[in-house]
Interface confidence: medium
């Protein structure tokens, strides 16, 4: 039994520039149940926010509804994988809604 492997945010999509969704690939689970959470901050802010909607985009996803989506901001996000043995973090991903399709 091991801590989880490093997850990877591999795709973000914004079909209408009003909402967007990002998906991650889990790393190895270490042989234990693993919880995933996506956190993000915006521009130069230090305040961290948790994913507002883990449901809409399906498994291993975070959906940002209209009220959370701004074409004026860069989102810096990462995924945390946690099991009883420890945690691991994805690399940070910088997302500008204007430039994702």
């Amino acid at each position: 039994q091991l801590p989880p492997g490093k997850p990877e945010i591999f795709k973000c999509r914004s079909p209408n520039k009003e909402t967007f969704t990002c998906w991650w690939r889990p790393g190895t689970d270490g042989g234990l149940p693993t919880n995933y959470s996506l956190t993000y901050h915006r521009e130069g802010e230090t305040l961290m926010h948790e994913c507002p909607d883990y449901i809409t985009g399906g498994p291993n996803s975070c959906h940002f509804g209209k009220q959370y989506t701004s074409m004026w901001r860069t989102y810096i996000m990462m995924v945390n994988a946690t099991n009883q043995m420890g945690s691991s973090f994805s690399d940070e991903l910088y997302v500008d809604v204007t430039y994702i399709v």
Partner: antibody
Framework: EVQLLESGGGLVQPGGSLRLSCAAS????????MHWVRQAPGKGLEWVSL????????SYTDSVKGRFTISRDNSKNTLYLQMNSLRAEDTAVYYC????????WGQGTLVTVSS | QSVLTQPPSASGTPGQRVTISCTGS?????????VHWYQQLPGTAPKLLIY???KRPSGVPDRFSGSKSGTSASLAISGLRSEDEADYYC???????????FGGGTKLTVL
């Protein structure tokens, strides 16, 4: 320490032009969208314009569309507002503000449009 | 006419609690956009007081608090002090204007 310093205000005749500058220091300017907000004498705050972190997107309040142009030079850490066809109702103190929430503001520069 | 509606004035005595309201519409506050509050002391530039409805930037006393519900928001100041005498503005993003909108401002007088 975050600092925003506006300049370029002054007295101009109706129909004239001015270019305002906002020099930024103490933070990574290119990470932030920037606003211009104005305040007419004795009145409240009025949002004027917004530019994205990379300069690729801009937005304006209706009353200045086609007359004002917001721009930025990230290599110089400077925000600009080019104001053409100025009207008496554009008379105000013009502030630049950092980020979508306006967490830091400059001290303002006064623009007076009068004949 | 401001897009967000605030009372033009409010007042209280030292130590009191005062509340300032900010009413918007379905294209701004009611669309789920965060409300921010700014304090403008006489002769100075505005300063961010509350952001994202209820969060205080570092250095802002916990006497200041914000809340939001539906198409309205409010700013509460408890333990009122003479140095709180200022103009207070709410602001939010507006979908239909694709920009910021402000309230008309509330002049707070400490009696």
């Amino acid at each position: 320490e975050v600092q925003l310093l506006e300049s370029g205000g002054g007295l101009v005749q109706p129909g004239g032009s001015l270019r305002l500058s906002c020099a930024a220091s103490g933070f990574t300017f290119s990470n932030y969208g920037m606003h211009w907000v104005r305040q007419a004498p004795g009145k409240g705050l009025e949002w004027v314009s917004l530019i994205s972190w990379d300069g690729g997107r801009t937005s304006y309040t209706d009353s200045v569309k086609g007359r004002f142009t917001i721009s930025r030079d990230n290599s110089k850490n400077t925000l600009y507002l080019q104001m053409n066809s100025l009207r008496a109702e554009d008379t105000a103190v013009y502030y630049c503000a950092r980020g979508l929430i306006g967490d830091n503001w400059g001290q303002g520069t006064l623009v007076t449009v009068s004949s | 006419q401001s897009v967000l509606t605030q009372p033009p004035s409010a007042s209280g005595t030292p130590g009191q609690r005062v509340t300032i309201s900010c009413t918007g519409s379905s294209s701004n506050i009611g669309a789920g956009y965060d409300v921010h509050w700014y304090q403008q002391l006489p002769g100075t530039a505005p300063k961010l007081l509350i952001y994202d409805n209820n969060k205080r930037p570092s250095g802002v006393p916990d006497r200041f608090s914000g809340s939001k519900s539906g198409t309205s928001a409010s700013l509460a100041i408890s333990g009122l002090r003479s140095e709180d005498e200022a103009d207070y503005y709410c602001a939010a993003w507006d979908d239909s204007l694709n920009g910021w909108v402000f309230g008309g401002g509330t002049k707070l007088t400490v009696l």
